[in-house]
């Protein structure tokens, strides 16, 4: 899963430029947009991926909010500022000096302000709810089988430790995948739930970020699981701060 030596590519991120200019002539890959070196043995951070994506932007998404503290990515694509580790900077600003605070998955969690806006810390998104609706099938999937295959998917494709897949709920045709990862639970080397969710979202949309891999082909006991819509909800360790004006 490291940068492939033979043809010098990044298996986990096709939005990279790779060349054999690393130590000892090893293949080294840099993210488009930021030029930051990426570790091709694991997922690239969402911040670097969004930054790379801005070279070929697509339409923004709008999701529905299920509860008062859940955030959705209403603002769609933007060109984010990433820190040296590739994480989102707590404060993001656009070219017209409009600024806002974001959480660890880059979703806005405050009203927009000006350059005087302060974002004291990057607030961690510790709970992600992925809400899927699958296309009609001959019968409902077996819940246990579905749980096993979705856990396998997150473990195998996104390298997310199973302990972070808190639950898989199923009421045909709705599947809900709960990812939970507190700051204290995330060890060095663990894939971030926000990054796994973003790769999954792009896979579901047919926009895989993996180099040269086919799109997502998920089957449960040989029966294709085809998703017709996805909503992703984000819950932060500290609730967001929006004015009442936004809520009306």
């Amino acid at each position: 899963h490291t940068a492939a030596q033979d043809n010098c590519t990044c298996p986990t991120n096709k939005m990279t430029v790779c060349s054999p200019d690393g130590p000892g002539g090893r293949c080294q890959c840099r993210a488009l947009g930021s030029g930051m070196a990426v570790d091709c043995s694991t997922l690239t951070s969402k911040c670097l991926l969004l930054k790379a994506r801005m070279s070929a932007p697509k339409n923004a998404r709008t999701l529905v909010r299920p509860s008062e503290h859940a955030l959705v990515d209403n603002d769609g694509l933007y060109d984010p500022d990433c820190d040296p580790e590739g994480r989102f900077k707590a404060r993001q600003c656009n070219q017209t000096s409009v600024c806002w605070c974001v959480n660890s998955v880059g979703v806005r969690r405050t009203d927009k302000g000006d350059l005087s806006l302060r974002c004291d810390e990057l607030v961690r998104t510790h709970h992600i709810l992925i809400d899927l609706r699958h296309r009609p099938t001959a019968g409902a999937f077996n819940h246990s089988d579905l749980d096993a295959e979705l856990r396998r998917l997150f473990r195998e494709r996104y390298r997310l430790h199973p302990k972070f897949v808190a639950a898989v709920h199923y009421e045909q045709p709705t599947i809900q995948i709960e990812l939970r990862q507190n700051t204290s639970q995330k060890a060095a080397g663990d894939v971030d739930i926000g990054d796994a969710a973003y790769y999954f979202e792009r896979d579901i949309k047919g926009e895989s970020l993996f180099q040269g891999r086919g799109g997502l082909d998920l089957r449960v006991r040989g029966e294709p699981l085809q998703v017709e819509r996805t909503l992703i909800y984000y819950l932060d360790e500290i609730p967001p701060k929006f004015s009442m004006k936004r809520l009306t």
Epitope: H143, S144, D145, D147, A148, E149, R151, R152, R155, E156, R157, H161, P162, K163, V165, A166, A167, V168, R213, G214, D217, R219, V220, R221, G222, E223
Partner: antibody, heavy 117, light 111 residues
């Protein structure tokens, strides 16, 4: 009825590559499930080597990953194991098996591979 | 890797006995709806045969005298009344994490 059958040389020289093939009947390997290799040294327990999925994705045991390749030939409904740089410690009965939803419901009868000069 | 420890390593019993084999995982192998622990029987010179999947589900064609229970890290395989054909080696296997791992086996012998 799903059936799996291993085939390949029973004797491999040290430092060479062990190559085995599993022929599947009764189910198309590209239609679903995960197609595994598992081994068992004489008188010892079972060790999972890795799998190739219905879509061609691989997953390998990290302890063997640098030496293992599992591939498939969907036209023949076969999947294969290659284990490079073998030593006497790789002497084992090698089984192919189908992983349904993370358990092995169908197994081949196994084939003994001895590594010896 | 998740370590699977079976006990006892070997066991002598008589036809008609009730036998219990335990399997302990080094960390939980359960999810909210699944227990990723499976049991196999192996006879000399033969491939393992699936008995119980996901801790308590009896594989089709397996006699009802076999049963499984447990969750989290501790699991049990029970044979309610031993039959002559049950003398074999039994393995547990976890599939919650890769690499998949097996217990070291429990050899069930005739007393």
């Amino acid at each position: 009825q799903v059936q799996l059958q291993e085939s390949g040389p029973g004797l491999v020289k040290p430092s060479q590559t062990l190559s085995l093939t599993c022929t599947v009947s009764g189910y198309s390997i590209s239609s679903g499930y995960y197609w595994n290799w598992i081994r068992q040294p004489p008188g010892k327990g079972l060790e999972w080597i890795g799998y190739i999925s219905y879509s061609g994705r691989n997953l390998y045991n990290p302890s063997l990953k640098s030496r293992v390749t599992i591939s498939r030939d969907t036209s023949k409904n076969q999947f294969s194991l290659k284990l490079s740089s073998v030593t006497a410690a790789d002497t084992a009965v090698y089984y192919c098996a189908r992983d349904t939803t993370a358990y092995f419901d169908y197994w081949g009868q196994g084939t003994l591979v001895t590594v010896s000069s | 890797d998740i370590q699977m420890t079976q006990s006892p390593s070997s066991l002598s019993a008589s036809v008609g006995d009730r036998v219990t084999i335990t399997c302990r995982a080094s960390e939980s192998v359960s999810s909210s709806v699944n227990r990723f622990l499976h049991w196999y029987q192996q006879k000399p010179g033969k491939a393992p045969k699936l008995l119980i999947y996901r801790a308590s589900n009896l594989e089709s064609g397996v006699p009802s005298r076999f049963s499984g229970s447990g969750s989290g890290t501790d699991f049990t395989l029970t044979i309610s009344s031993l039959q002559p054909e049950d003398f074999a080696t039994y393995y547990c296997q976890q599939s919650n994490e890769d690499p998949y791992t097996f217990g070291q086996g429990t050899k069930l012998e005739i007393k």
